[in-house]
């Protein structure tokens, strides 16, 4: 970027600039017409017979240099031929000298500085490319000549440019004064000010632009050259808040939306809101969740809404004497979410009617909360009590919600006291294909034996297809098609109507080896 | 503002010549180019030629080749012109006129006159 | 030499009409054309330069076109101070011409 000091070409009133010495042959302020058509101030000093050592000087207005360190002077100028030029003698030249001289003030007058180098400084001797040239019954032909030079370092308020003829016949058609600055950037949505170059290259600290943080890492800075370009190097840069996300070839950070967010700082765009929430606002980092719906502490801020489960569907009971197997569908609802588990709640009512939590007598497998699959066994129930069983579907967001657990209840009454265990069993008869068993009538608490259920299998068969099962009304039974000499084992249990009491011990018994034993009572 | 101030009149007789002078007041005379223009009564403008002094040499219409002289002096800001063989034809007022920008100044060769002398008239009788 | 022909030779108009006046070279002369105006008993006036270039004072009516071998001069709304002779002036290379010229009358 360069910023302009002094351009001639942009001047309509006279120069006036100050001419040294005030003789004739000094440098005279004309009009020109340059390439664009357009009348500009031009100065022309053509004294090509001028006597050796005289020079002429022209100098320039007062320029503040605003700041800048090093400042360019573009000067395109023509020059006659000294070839061309009949009249000229050997003091005739094709160059002249560009001086400078810095003041903090517009100090100069038309004697001082002193018209020589020191205090002037010299910035160049500056010859001409192109020169003017004229044939006997030719077109004069010639071409602008451009130079552009460096000044400084400088460190005064301003200064002043000087130009030395020293025999050429020239004309300066436009100066162009500027420094060169490195433009603002933005660049990975940090912003770099405009910086005029101090030095050869110069740090410049980045800032993030509005709604943007630091990224992670040292502060980003860029280089500015002492050319007014910026030194090509990574920024690390920053990145746009939470709530909003980089736009405009990442040079500014744009609010999400409504409907949209972004929940964390850094790259990536506004995503619309997940299931169940929603941003009223713009530049949202988190969508609400709308009623009804949560985010447990340990989603993430972009998870969508969820809501706890719907009750169990379902609840099968399966009693078995003083163990209860429960069993239930998952819910319709699930809420959303993947973290399901189920929970029961138990409250016992005795014989009499009056009913409390239940006891620490149950016990729950694999537990009465906390269950991940859709059972689960109760084991101690009391004879002849009512059970009622409060099973709740929970997920991570149960706890946030306010109002009652939906849930699904079963009630369950426990039969009487079933018999006790047959344990006294005897074999009164054994063939090579039967056995004859007699037992005990246990003594039943709630009622009499309704009949007995006998298990066998052979001994070392111990498949559930190998297990045969006969029931009977009186306390003994025969078991017949049974292989000859084998081992049997034999468990028996009585119902009553309270329902069967547990087998008991297994009983060893052996079928005879062949017929001719005949049958043989066994005494137990 | 520059002022070009001619010679004044003269009557001349058929065969001989005719120096007619321009000088040119305030600053650069040099680098411009000074034309000569004529104009016989009642006719148009007829070019005769220019010179740019610091060059010396000067270009001339085919017309005159040969019967015209441009000169000019740098030191005193002036220049001349002088034809020779006059003829009753040459009877006319005589201009010398100026470019509105020097040969360093302009980067085309426009060569437009804004400038003009008030004229010599010249009569060529016997 | 190159040749410079106007048209018309002469022309009458009234205050407020738009008058145009042509000039054609017998070769390319790019834009180096010239037009003058010239009152009885005056020197020449510089009016445009380079084709269209109107030259510094002269007023805006005044305007000028083309390139190669054909050109324009005209005058937009003509005023009383307009009636004149009119001249295009060739300086393509070193020996320039002028067209024969232009008379503007009043009707």
């Known amino acids: 970027l360069e910023e302009t000091l002094l351009n001639t070409k942009l001047e309509t009133a006279d120069l006036k600039w100050v001419t040294f010495p005030q003789v004739d042959g000094q440098w005279e302020e004309l009009s020109g017409l340059d390439e664009e058509q357009h009348s500009v101030r031009t100065y022309e000093v053509c004294d090509v017979q001028r006597a050796p050592g005289q020079a002429h000087w022209l100098r320039t207005g007062w320029v503040p240099r605003r700041g800048a360190v090093h400042v360019y002077a573009t000067l395109r100028f023509t020059m006659l031929e000294c070839l061309s030029l009949p009249r000229a003698g050997r003091s005739c030249k094709e160059t002249f000298t560009v001086f400078y001289y810095e003041s903090d003030a517009d100090t100069a007058t038309a004697l001082t500085p002193a018209w020589m180098e020191n205090p002037y400084i010299k910035v160049d001797t500056v010859a001409a490319e192109h020169l003017t040239r004229k044939r006997p019954g030719a077109e004069a032909t010639g071409k602008v000549n451009v130079k552009t030079l460096r000044l400084g370092p400088l460190s005064k308020a301003g200064f002043y440019l000087a130009f030395q003829d020293q025999g050429a016949c020239m004309a300066l058609l436009s100066l162009h004064l500027f420094y060169k600055k490195c433009a603002q950037l933005t660049v990975n949505l940090t912003r770099f000010p405009e910086t005029v170059p101090r030095e050869l290259v110069v740090p410049v600290a980045g800032s993030c632009v509005v709604d943007a943080v630091p990224a992670p890492g040292p502060s980003p800075s860029l280089y500015c050259r002492e050319d007014g370009q910026w030194a090509e190097q990574p920024v690390t840069g920053c990145s746009c808040a939470p709530g909003f996300e980089a736009a405009e070839g990442n040079t500014k950070c744009r609010a999400c939306a409504q409907g949209t967010f972004k929940p964390l700082s850094g790259e990536g765009s506004c995503q619309p809101c997940p299931a169940n929430s929603h941003s009223n606002t713009i530049g949202s980092a988190v969508c609400q969740c709308r009623v009804g719906y949560f985010r447990a502490r340990t989603d993430p801020r972009g998870a969508p809404c969820t809501t706890p489960p719907s009750a169990p569907r379902s609840v099968v009971s399966r009693l078995n004497g003083s163990s209860l197997h429960l069993e239930w569908s998952a819910p319709l609802e699930s809420g959303g979410r993947e973290d399901l588990t189920y929970a029961l709640r138990c409250r016992e009512c005795r014989p009499g009617g009056s009913c409390a939590p239940c006891g620490g007598d149950l016990t729950f497998d694999p537990g009465p909360r906390d269950l991940v699959e859709p059972w689960v066994v109760v084991r101690g129930l009391r004879p002849d009590f009512t059970y009622t069983f409060e099973v709740t579907a929970l997920n991570g967001v149960s706890s946030l919600a306010t109002g009652p657990v939906p849930f699904e209840p079963v009630n369950v009454t426990t039969d009487r006291e079933v018999p006790p265990a047959v344990s006294d069993i005897r074999v009164t008869r054994s063939s090579p294909s039967s056995l004859s068993l007699a037992w005990a009538v246990p003594r039943a608490p709630s009622g009499a034996v309704l009949d007995y259920e006998v298990k066998y299998h052979e001994k070392g068969a111990e498949g559930p297809s190998s297990v045969r099962f006969l029931k009977t009304s009186e306390n003994r039974a025969e078991l017949r098609g049974l292989k000859r000499g084998a081992s049997y084992l034999v468990q028996v249990r009585a119902r009553s109507e309270a329902g069967y009491g547990p087998f008991g011990q297994e009983h060893h018994s052996q079928t005879q080896l062949d017929e001719s034993e005949g049958w043989r009572e066994q005494l137990a | 503002q520059v002022q070009l101030v001619q010679s004044g009149a003269e009557v001349k007789k058929p065969g001989s010549s005719v120096k007619v002078s321009c000088k040119a007041s305030?600053?650069?005379?040099?680098?411009?180019?000074i034309s000569w223009v004529r104009q016989a009564p009642g006719q148009g403008l007829e070019w005769m030629g220019q010179?740019?002094?610091?060059?010396?040499?000067?270009d001339y219409a085919q017309k005159f080749q040969g019967r015209v002289t441009i000169t000019a002096d740098e030191s005193t800001s002036t220049a001349y012109m002088e034809l020779s063989s006059l003829r009753s034809e040459d009877t006319a007022v005589y201009y010398c006129?100026?470019?509105?920008?020097?040969?360093?100044?302009?980067?085309?060769?426009?060569?437009?006159?804004?400038?003009w002398g008030q004229g010599t008239l010249v009569t060529v009788s016997s | 030499d190159i040749q410079m022909t106007q048209s018309p030779s002469s022309l009458s108009a009234s205050v407020g009409d738009r008058v145009t006046i042509t000039c054609r070279a017998s070769q390319n002369i790019n834009n180096f054309l010239n037009w003058y105006q010239q009152k009885p008993g005056k020197a020449p006036k510089l009016l445009i330069y380079?084709?269209?270039i109107l030259q510094s004072g002269v007023p805006s009516r005044f305007s000028g076109s083309g390139s190669g071998t054909d050109f324009t001069l005209t005058i937009s709304s003509l005023q009383p101070e307009d009636f004149a002779v009119y001249y295009c002036?060739?300086?393509?290379?070193?020996?320039?011409?002028f067209g024969q010229g232009t008379k503007v009358e009043i009707k």
């Open positions: 380079g084709s269209s």
């Open positions: 010179i740019i002094p610091i060059f010396g040499d000067a």
């Open positions: 002036h060739q300086v393509s290379d070193t020996s320039d011409t």
């Open positions: 006129a100026r470019s509105s920008y020097t040969i360093l100044t302009t980067y085309y060769n426009y060569n437009a006159m804004d400038n």
């Open positions: 305030g600053g650069t005379f040099s680098t411009y180019a």
